[in-house]
């Protein structure tokens, strides 16, 4: 089986990655805070995409530590029990309920800093994490519906005739591929226990003047295209691999 | 089994401060727990006033600002609510109560044992 | 603050039937909601906490629903103890806040 060449059949046309920093956070300064108050209480709720392997902090609503009672963070995390971290603050006391997952810690002590840390985060780490701020005027809230990207591993190779495969494997959430230009595609979606979802595009082209196809995969943490040469050599399959 | 006792005098004049206590037997209130008043109005109302923890520190209703001390003797187990400037609409039956044992420190905010209460009229 | 509506203010029922105390949140309490039994000159009881969750000692005639804003305090079979003042009281949130009372009476 001949793998394709860069430097001939085979070639990166572009790559567009957002590579995601070490660590992630929708934390405010002190600036923005003092700006946006009201507005971040009432924005409760926020979707949240992280990329595997990063670090995540979540942040709590800018209240005062001095006006505070309490400091929860609930997590609820799929097929397991909610987990509760709290700190009461009057008897500097933390308590931990139903929380067995190491990674996920408060940033530093509760009394300097309400935020949550989730250290390298995994697939298992999707869910609904929530910051409640007791004080003597209510509660206040913060929830984050934290979504786990991962990359898909993608591959292009012709298996046959005018035929190309494209594959976005293992991704989170499923990529998008599209090719230029258009064939007789099928699609194909593979989900995986863990979440990830392998697609498959395979294309024809009759139209015997297509000598070059490029393929483009579409994802939340970046995009990628590869184009590849149509070689009528029959029974010959050529590929590679793109990380 | 804890049981709570209110005492204090039943008629105070208006302008004057209100003062209760609160007498704890069968458990030491420097030993967990937060400690509560809560009061009844004519008509059958219930307003939570406040607290003290077991460590000392306190949390009052905002709106009755600073009329509003609770304190506690340790010595005596005992916890004291003092309500400054009083007008007739403090008249209430005042009760003494202990949270819930706190699961996770959070929403366990209801109260298991209560004293009977103490009846206060603010007149001249 | 959480406004607590209790109703109705008064009911009047035999021993061996059975009553509803309904409580309404004036915002989403989700299910932090305790029930309480008064009684002239003795101390209160706690029946019910977390909307649903008998507190030791309460017998099992007594039952507690709902979620959000609307909860049910549903009494069955009562017997002569259970007349008297009952209250509502969310615990979602400070200040704790009551309902206004439902007075149970016998027919």
């Known amino acids: 089986e001949g793998a394709a060449q860069p430097n001939n059949s085979l070639m990166l046309q572009t790559s567009k990655e957002n590579h995601a920093l070490a660590s992630s956070s929708l934390c405010m300064d002190e600036k923005q805070i003092t700006q946006n108050y009201s507005k971040v209480l009432a924005e409760v709720n926020t979707s949240w995409p992280v990329k595997m392997a990063t670090n995540a902090v979540l942040c709590c609503p800018p209240i005062a530590l001095r006006n505070l009672i309490i400091i929860t963070w609930e997590i609820i995390l799929r097929g397991q029990p909610s987990c509760t971290k709290a700190y009461k603050k009057e008897t500097n006391e933390t308590k931990e309920t139903n929380c067995t997952d190491e990674r996920i810690t408060w940033v530093s002590r509760p009394d300097q800093n309400s935020d949550l840390q989730i250290r390298t985060v995994a697939i298992t780490h999707d869910g609904y994490y929530r910051c409640i701020m007791v004080t003597p005027d209510g509660n206040f809230h913060r929830g984050y519906h934290l979504q786990v990207l991962v990359t898909p591993e993608v591959t292009l190779f012709q298996n046959r005739n005018r035929t190309a495969v494209c594959k976005a494997v293992a991704g989170k959430p499923a990529a998008h591929i599209s090719w230029i230009p258009e064939g007789d595609c099928a699609t194909k979606q593979e989900y995986w226990s863990n979440g990830t979802v392998t697609v498959k595009s395979t294309c024809h082209w009759e139209v015997h003047n297509v000598s070059t196809v490029t393929c483009h995969v579409s994802h939340l943490t970046g995009n990628k295209s590869l184009y590849i040469e149509l070689l009528p050599v029959p029974g010959a399959k050529k590929s590679a691999k793109l990380y | 089994e804890i049981q709570l006792q209110e005492s204090g005098p039943g008629l105070v004049k208006p302008s004057q401060s209100l003062s209760l206590t609160c007498s704890v037997t069968?458990?030491?209130?420097?030993?967990?727990?937060?400690w509560s008043w809560i009061r009844k109005f004519p008509g059958n109302k219930m307003e939570w006033m406040g607290y003290?923890?077991?460590?000392?520190?306190?949390n009052y209703k905002p709106s009755l600002g600073s009329r509003i001390s609770i304190t506690r003797d340790t010595s005596k187990n005992q916890f004291f609510l003092q309500l400054n400037s009083v007008s007739p609409e403090d008249t209430a039956t005042y009760y003494c109560a202990k949270y819930n044992e706190y699961k996770s420190y959070i929403y366990d905010w209801y109260f298991d044992f209560w004293g009977p209460g103490t009846m206060v009229t603010v007149s001249s | 603050e959480v406004q607590m509506t209790q109703s109705p203010s008064t009911l009047t029922a035999s021993p061996g039937e059975s009553v509803s105390i309904n409580c309404k949140a004036s915002?989403?309490?989700?299910?932090?909601l305790a029930w309480y039994q008064q009684k002239p000159g003795k101390p209160n009881k706690l029946l019910i906490y977390s909307g649903s969750t008998l507190h030791s000692g309460t017998p099992s005639r007594f039952s507690g629903s709902g979620f959000g804003t609307d909860f049910t305090l549903t009494i069955r079979n009562l017997e002569p103890e259970d007349f008297g003042l009952y209250y509502c009281?969310?615990?979602?949130?400070?200040?704790?806040?009551f309902g206004s009372g439902t007075k149970l009476e016998i027919k």
């Open positions: 003290i923890n077991y460590g000392g520190s306190t």
């Open positions: 915002k989403n309490i989700r299910s932090y």
């Open positions: 069968g458990y030491t209130i420097t030993s967990g727990y937060d």
């Open positions: 009281q969310q615990h979602h949130e400070y200040p704790l806040t």
